[in-house]
């Protein structure tokens, strides 16, 4: 959480999660009747999300400040973090209930289990993140955030198994960014592109964020990035003030997040 380019930024807010995504009409927000919302989802090979599906998505970081139709004529929106302008200071599904007038105009929440999606919030002790479609080439115009949150006191050991992104000198086209924090505002570690395997990274605290972005042109093979938990007692966690040792980058301790 924080300011970036003068905007309050919060990258835990995923645009798609657990097959659920938000859609609005081409003309903008709150233009779809129930029948039209249903049609929007069906044209994309999906269907209107159920309340349960929307809640499951919200639990892993799906947050949209726009009311939309769900299955069975229900309207609502998912709030991960309460704010003054959205959700009346509450978290959860802000539920407008089943609407009697299906000609009311809202947005749509669609569910498509086959949608190619990426990112999420992860609390598992270990996991492998893959670029969308890996081992096939990733698509243009991708933005993915992986947020890792382990138990307090634990740290994260990140290693790159495969890595092949479009190369350009400043990594301005396609890149992976690593942040030693729970957002993409604080704790910038590095930006990576090309086909050389970056060195391992060990976090200072129990949280880390990976961001993947691809532009509108050339694509490449993609990546696999693995993380494992480093427990407080383990040997490598004692070396946190060392800049690099072997093929590992240890980050100087700064903060942990509960």
């Amino acid at each position: 959480w924080g300011f970036k380019n003068g905007i309050f930024h919060n990258s835990i807010w995923l645009e798609q999660a657990a097959g659920v995504y938000h859609r609005e009409a081409r003309a903008g927000r709150y233009k779809l009747t129930y029948a039209e919302a249903k049609a929007v989802c069906e044209f994309e090979g999906g269907r209107l999300a159920t309340y349960k599906q929307l809640e499951a998505a919200r639990k892993i970081g799906f947050h949209v400040c726009a009311a939309g139709w769900m299955a069975k004529g229900r309207v609502g929106y998912p709030i991960v973090k309460p704010g003054p302008n959205c959700g009346f200071g509450k978290t959860g599904i802000i539920d407008y209930g089943i609407r009697l007038n299906r000609s009311e105009r809202w947005d749509a929440y669609c569910y498509n289990p086959h949608a190619k999606e990426c990112g999420g919030v992860f609390t598992d002790p270990k996991r492998i993140f893959k670029s969308p479609g890996f081992p096939n080439e990733y698509d243009d115009n991708q933005v993915c955030y992986w947020h890792i949150r382990l138990k307090y006191g634990q740290r994260i050991h990140l290693s790159f198994l495969d890595f092949d992104l479009e190369h350009d000198p400043g990594c301005l086209a396609d890149y992976v960014e690593i942040y030693d924090s729970y957002d993409d505002v604080h704790g910038f570690v590095g930006r990576y592109c090309g086909d050389e395997l970056p060195e391992d990274i060990i976090s200072t605290g129990n949280v880390m964020t990976l961001k993947f972005l691809s532009d509108a042109s050339v694509t490449a093979g993609g990546f696999q990035i693995k993380y494992v938990t480093v427990d407080p007692a383990s040997k490598s966690s004692q070396a946190k003030n060392t800049s690099t040792t072997g093929n590992k980058k240890f980050l100087p301790g700064r903060f942990s997040h509960l």
Epitope: A39, E42, F43, G45, H114, A115, N141
Partner: antibody, heavy 120, light 106 residues
Framework: QVQLQQSGAELAKPGASVRLSCQAS????????MHWVKQRPRQGLEWIGY????????KCHQKFKDKATLTADKSSNTASMQLSSLTYEDSAVYYC?????????????WGQGTTLTVSS | ENVLTQSPAIMSASPGEKVTMTCSAT?????MHWYQQKSSTSPKLWIY???KLASGVPGRFSGSGSGNSYSLTISSMEAEDVATYYC?????????FGAGTKLELK
């Protein structure tokens, strides 16, 4: 500028299959949808179906579901339509047309058309 | 299926005359779009979202309507307007075209 370049005229026998292609240029192929439209001689326009190149999802009009198979190759920015079990009624001009992914849809650019003649 | 009925099927107009053609839909749509097709060429987007003129379309063309009833109007007919005009709805599956209005020069 946006261009949809369609493959050349085809002559096929009844019962055969044919593959028509539509190469897109001048825009990001995966950001838009590609539709196919049929026009028989001196007749109106008939929507066949569409493909979403980013996901590969496609859907055809019920009338064409056993006739047309739509594909998209992102590496070459090409959409294709295979027509199978050809009959004389399949003789027509076939157009590819691009639409925005925003609802409701309309076609802002069209290919020049491919003429298919089915004849024994 | 949302059937679009265009009328008239064929019409002729003198240069300078006002021309109106209509399109009615069996199911309500939020927008109607119109295409112009001249003989042996691809259709061209002419009017989209009911009333917005596509790039390069002369200002004498206009579109209006809502729900089930839409129209295309030419305020002053010109020779270059001779073509067939198709209405199109992109709101409901399957997407559908009208049968067309053929506009001729009197």
């Amino acid at each position: 500028q946006v261009q949809l370049q369609q493959s050349g005229a085809e002559l096929a026998k009844p019962g055969a299959s044919v593959r028509l292609s539509c190469q897109a240029s001048g825009y990001t192929f995966t950001t838009y949808w590609m539709h196919w439209v049929k026009q028989r001689p001196r007749q109106g326009l008939e929507w066949i179906g569409y493909i979403i190149p980013s996901s590969g999802y496609s859907k055809c009009h019920q009338k064409f579901k056993d006739k047309a198979t739509l594909t998209a190759d992102k590496s070459s920015n090409t959409a294709s339509m295979q027509l199978s079990s050809l009959t004389y009624e399949d003789s027509a001009v076939y157009y590819c047309a691009r639409s925005t992914s925003g609802y409701p849809y309309y076609f802002d650019y069209w290919g020049q058309g491919t003429t298919l003649t089915v004849s024994s | 299926e949302n059937v679009l009925t265009q009328s008239p099927a064929i019409m002729s107009a003198s240069p300078g005359e006002k021309v109106t053609m209509t399109c009615s839909a069996t199911s309500s749509v939020s927008y109607m779009h119109w295409y112009q097709q001249k003989s042996s060429t691809s259709p061209k987007l002419w009017i989209y979202d009911t009333s917005k003129l596509a790039s390069g379309v002369p200002g004498r063309f206009s579109g209006s309507g809502s729900g089930n009833s839409y129209s295309l109007t030419i305020s002053s007919m010109e020779a270059e307007d001779v073509a067939t005009y198709y209405c199109f709805q992109g709101s409901w599956y399957p997407l559908t075209f009208g049968a067309g209005t053929k506009l001729e020069l009197k």
